[in-house]
């Protein structure tokens, strides 16, 4: 069998809401993956599991099941959303993210994703990790950078 390639493209959008009383931030982060099937037979994408970390703490997890079938020598782009919560011992971030005197409220998040594919009864797991900037101060749609090695997110104006 030839390789199945998983490429984490980046954050597509981040939608933020706040609970002032609990000093909690809710970030719905939509990410984009490219999955390429280099084989001459179809491959099933069984599931995608993802988690997001902030300051070494897991702030969100998501799992997608029975996602899609990728045909021979084909590629599919898949978006998945991870709901995240920044609260409790990180409640100081509420002060940061809602402080309007700061124009861009970029925080560094670690995106981790594992894709499980299956073909001929055989399962394979491919994982990726990437640090990304996300603005916790406003809803943002990002232009996905194409570079494999550098993913600089620029908020659309």
């Amino acid at each position: 069998p030839r390789s199945i390639e998983v490429k984490y493209i980046g954050v597509k959008s981040a939608y933020v809401s706040y609970d002032a009383e609990k000093r909690t931030i809710y970030l719905n982060i939509t990410n984009t993956l490219n999955i390429t099937n280099n084989n001459y037979y179809s491959v099933e994408v069984e599931n995608i599991t993802a988690q997001v970390q902030f300051s070494k703490t897991v702030i969100g997890k998501a799992r997608l099941n029975n996602i899609t079938n990728i045909g021979p020598l084909d590629m599919k782009q898949i978006d998945y959303t991870v709901p995240t919560v920044i609260a409790e011992e990180m409640s100081y971030m509420y002060d940061f993210c809602t402080l309007l005197s700061i124009k861009v409220h970029n925080i560094v998040l670690m995106m981790q994703v594992t894709v499980t594919t299956a073909y001929f009864g055989h399962s394979e797991q491919i994982s990726q990790e990437r640090y990304q900037y996300v603005d916790c101060g406003r809803n943002t749609t990002y232009q996905l950078a194409q570079s494999e090695y550098l993913n600089v997110l620029q908020p659309q104006q």
Epitope: Y18, Y92, Y94, L99, L100, R138
Partner: antibody
Framework: EVQLVESGGGLVKPGGSLKLSCAAS????????MSWVRETPEKRLEWVAF????????YYADNVKDRFTISRDNAKNNLYLQMRHLKSEDTAMYYC??????????WGQGTLVTVSV | DIVMTQAAFSNPVTLGTSASISCRSS???????????LFWYLQKPGQSPQLLIY???NLASGVPDRFSSSGSGTDFTLRISRVEAEDVGVYYC?????????FGGGTKLEIK
Amino acid sequence: EVQLVESGGGLVKPGGSLKLSCAASGFTFSNYAMSWVRETPEKRLEWVAFISDGGGYIYYADNVKDRFTISRDNAKNNLYLQMRHLKSEDTAMYYCARDGGTGFTYWGQGTLVTVSV
Amino acid sequence: DIVMTQAAFSNPVTLGTSASISCRSSKSLLHSNGITYLFWYLQKPGQSPQLLIYQMSNLASGVPDRFSSSGSGTDFTLRISRVEAEDVGVYYCVQNLELPYTFGGGTKLEIK
């Protein structure tokens, strides 16, 4: 317990200089923006200056711009306000305050600055 | 600059009864993120100001629930449900929507 302790106030002649300090403890200083706020003899509160957690954003009230400089030393948990070309209208009690989206959550006890001949 | 307007004195209030303090801003303090950037502080005699209410309606840590606040984008009211002697002082409203942050002139709570 969060504590902010100001120092450096005193009596100074018009045109003179003073440097105020604010020692922070009881919280992770480098996580928070800080502001200086002053209380005039007429008991009015005026925001003076702002500095973001990492010092990347700095703002001043128009009446102190080009005369006052706010700075911070996150390694020492200290906030500063360098005041130059002082005027009589700068006479006030100066407070440092922890700043953020939830307001000035903590204030120091204040340090009095008197500008007089 | 945003102008914050307060009456200098409240109506004299009897201990144990309720009191209201008003504040008006020259511009709506409701941001597009859904937060209203209006804050209330109390300065007791001889003390530093202390935060009472953040983001228009949220009680700051350690503040008794006798205090509450409500408002629209420009008109705000601080309510004290059962006034106690320790509530005496000057109440300031502040906007943090735009720089420069601006304070109201303060309202002195008067006890009968």
